[in-house]
């Protein structure tokens, strides 16, 4: 999906009003020195691409993020504020239902959510002139 035509300000508002708080709750009890961000993004569409990938694509050691509250709210925000996003996700959602597993918060998941927080920070305030 190409995130170029999303309403970035509305997505930012959704993030700041609820998603950010859910991420903080997920990370509660984790030391702020624990994880170094290794995933970065250069502009808002790129940031959303990386956010979508880390939030919804299962990775080795962390298969369950898509069922978390912050993930569901992220999905809702993208569906509302990114034209045509919902249609591209139907097949992906069906595939996810087939491999649904119980929620387990692993250290790998905590690291991944720390990366997500970093990506959202860059989405909210990209360093490039074109904001």
């Amino acid at each position: 999906y190409d995130f170029t035509n999303c309403d970035f300000e509305k997505i930012k508002a959704a993030y700041l009003s609820t998603i950010s708080k859910d991420l903080i709750t997920y990370m509660s009890g984790t030391k702020s020195t624990e994880f170094n961000n290794t995933v970065s993004c250069s502009n808002r569409p790129h940031c959303l691409t990386e956010i979508q990938s880390l939030t919804f694509n299962p990775t080795a050691g962390c298969a369950s993020l898509a069922k978390e509250m912050f993930a569901m709210k992220t999905k809702a925000a993208l569906a509302i504020w990114c034209p045509g996003y919902s249609e591209t996700q139907i097949n992906a959602t069906q595939a996810m239902k087939k491999r649904r597993k119980r929620k387990v918060t692993t250290n790998k998941c905590l690291e991944q959510v720390s990366q997500l927080q970093g990506l959202w920070r860059r989405f909210n305030r990209p360093l490039l002139k074109q904001q």
Partner: antibody, heavy 119, light 107 residues
């Protein structure tokens, strides 16, 4: 506990350079932007620029472009602001600050470094 | 550059009374406005981010509102510890810019 500790006061001659350091602790240094802001005596706040310590990306206020250089050393968790071609109007308190967890504000500030430019 | 204009530049308030500071942007900054307080002899400290969100530990008597070009910081009941200079800041466009500051004194 997050802390930003800045270097001590400096007295400089016009035309010279100054390098102010900002040592961070209590968080993953490379994960958060470091901002630089200055405040002339009795005046308001003026943004100088920002650096991403993770990759070295910077953005400067045009008013300081060519004179200000922001760098970061991940090995020591220290950010630096160097200002060259100093003039008397550069006399100010220089602050470093860290972006907050959402990327929309500065949540921790250094104690400030007084730079006096005088002949 | 986006110019942030604060009014009034100073105000003197009786403890327990309300106070209000206005901040106007020269062009729309969406909701990308932050409020800081600089107490005498100290570094600035974060109060409100993204127009109306309280930073951790900031008392409920502080509130922010507005969008686009007009923003307001309100203190419902001023206390002695609230003295200092209040700054609004926009982070919608580079360069980031601050208002000129509003000095709050206690009567």
């Amino acid at each position: 506990e997050v802390q930003l500790v800045q270097s001590g006061a400096e007295v400089k001659k016009p035309g010279s350079s100054v390098k102010v350091s900002c040592k961070a602790s209590g968080y993953a240094f490379s994960n958060y932007l470091i901002e630089w802001v200055r405040q002339a005596p009795g005046q308001g706040l003026e943004w100088i620029g920002v650096i991403d310590p993770g990759n070295g990306d910077t953005n400067y206020n045009e008013n300081f472009k060519g004179r200000a250089t922001l760098t970061a050393d991940k090995s020591t968790s220290t950010a630096y602001m160097e200002l060259s071609s100093l003039r008397s109007e550069d006399t100010a308190v220089y602050y470093c600050a860290r972006e907050d967890n959402t990327g929309t504000a500065f949540d921790y500030w250094g104690q400030g470094t007084t730079v006096t430019v005088s002949s | 550059d986006i110019v942030m204009t604060q009014t009034p530049l100073s105000l003197s308030v009786t403890p327990g009374q309300p106070a209000s500071i206005s901040c106007k942007a020269s062009q729309s900054v969406s909701s990308d406005v932050t409020w800081y307080l600089q107490k005498p002899g100290q570094s600035p400290q974060l109060l409100i981010y993204y127009v109306s969100n309280h930073y951790t530990g900031v008392p409920d008597r502080f509130s922010g509102s507005g969008s686009g070009t007009d923003f307001t910081l309100k203190i419902s009941r001023v206390e002695a510890e609230d003295v200092g200079v209040y700054y609004c800041q926009q982070h919608h466009r580079f360069p980031l810019t601050f208002g000129q500051g509003t000095k709050l004194e206690i009567k």
